[in-house]
Amino acid sequence: IIPVEEENPDFWNREAAEALGAAKKLQPAQTAAKNLIIFLGDGMGVSTVTAARILKGQKKDKLGPEIPLAMDRFPYVALSKTYNVDKHVPDSGATATAYLCGVKGNFQTIGLSAAARFNQCNTTRGNEVISVMNRAKKAGKSVGVVTTTRVQHASPAGTYAHTVNRNWYSDADVPASARQEGCQDIATQLISNMDIDVILGGGRKYMFRMGTPDPEYPDDYSQGGTRLDGKNLVQEWLAKRQGARYVWNRTELMQASLDPSVTHLMGLFEPGDMKYEIHRDSTLDPSLMEMTEAALRLLSRNPRGFFLFVEGGRIDHGHHESRAYRALTETIMFDDAIERAGQLTSEEDTLSLVTADHSHVFSFGGYPLRGSSIFGLAPGKARDRKAYTVLLYGNGPGYVLKDGARPDVTESESGSPEYRQQSAVPLDEETHAGEDVAVFARGPQAHLVHGVQEQTFIAHVMAFAACLEPYTACDLAPPAGTTD
């Protein structure tokens, strides 16, 4: 489809002139940030952003690429180098350490410098690094963690935990030898390492003793509590805090977020990860956008400001399954959360960053026609005289042979939410990719986000913008609308 205006050079010249005019008007804010929000699209590489943009545009009955995402409207962009100290292609644990603590670590470790070794408990002590969220709390700000994964998962754990193994969700996951050496599971660290005002996501089962039935799935033993130490961590968390509330469904979340007596809120909406957006029961489970809104309601009551981590964590899971439909619909919900947060905050006093921890081996090619479905087929046939999809994976479970050859694919098959895009190499799970990812920035000190940077730069920009350690002598004017 060729839109009639786009045939005319004037259309493009006028559009570019408008963009240039807006760019010339950009004025770096010289004030500090009162609030910090980091939106983390887990696995959201640039190809994912592009494909999600097209899908979101097409859901609005447009051709696709011309409609900006909410994140596209952020004025400053940089590239982030995502490698871990010991790996070219990283995981979500060590990358979380980089963008949340400002220090690179080793693959599958969280909140520890690279002097700590994966799975070796005795390398933990003395190698802990402190997150910007922790520093924000010490500075008197309210802090929150929102995710579509388990709240004990690698990315959110980077805000509060220190562990040599990202898989140590509950004490049942920690080897006895490591427990004896004093290594704590991530769920325990969630409630004891620091005071988090808002915790929203999945991960109920890691908080309760083995045999505790889940409130949503009481007949499914596999969804019940997993803890061996007999503890009820939710109860412990509530007991330590006046004004604290625990919720496990959407209705309770909405009520709690509007209740002025609630000062601390923990919402755990699934035993493990939350459901994909396309499978979510909208009466029982909140969306990422709704959780973000609830968190902002509570956190913005603090006159000193807040730090909020918001993760679209299952973009990554969709890609690992080689199900682009899932990854892209998760990305759209993530973008919706960014848009809603933008409506509820001011760029005068809030530094908002959007980034990914790493990319995926997810490609978008084959010369598809403008306006054609992002899940559709390339116009021509491959050398084997069979159709191929415009979305593909370099490796993963989409590698299937039919009678010793690559199977043909139809438009109706490739458009199914369950369809796995084909890959060149057979793996049980598609892998992360090592190329740089984008960092989008808006608000006070956002202009510092430029060029090609180490992933650790993100944490340092946030700390500097809010005059947190080690930048308390930041020499920035106070945030807009505040006085000394």
Partner: nanobody, 122 residues
């Protein structure tokens, strides 16, 4: 100028099928889009389905999804609307239309046929 002529309408029992045709003359369709619309007595004209001439994008109203299919025969310069599992509420005059996509105004239709009556009886 493009002239559009619909045919294929008629009386059919609920649950039955019809295939409407929309023949274009005067100018090759090229990169025009084809839309099908309908207007029931005393109601507004409503969107049914559309397809780009190159087949890159197809869209159906929720009320007809899974029952109606738009197709195009480029060689014959003709578009079709295959209607299966017809319901009494599908009774209307059906129009085909051709137009260009505009980034500013969206899907626009500059040329319209005269319409063909479809009546679905119970």
């Amino acid at each position: 100028q493009v002239q559009l002529v619909e045919s294929g309408g008629g009386l059919v029992q609920a649950g039955g099928s019809l295939r409407l045709s929309c023949a274009a003359s005067g100018r090759a369709f090229g990169d025009y889009n084809i839309g099908w619309f309908r207007q029931a007595p005393g109601k507004e004209r409503e969107f049914v389905a559309r397809r780009t001439w190159d087949g890159s994008s197809t869209r159906y109203d929720d009320s007809v999804k899974g029952r109606f299919t738009v197709s195009i025969d480029n060689a014959k310069n003709t578009a079709y609307l295959q209607m299966n599992s017809l319901k009494t509420e599908d009774t209307a005059v059906y129009y085909c239309a051709a137009g260009r996509y505009s980034r500013v105004r969206g899907w626009e239709y500059d040329y319209w046929g005269q319409g063909t009556q479809v009546t679905v009886s119970s």
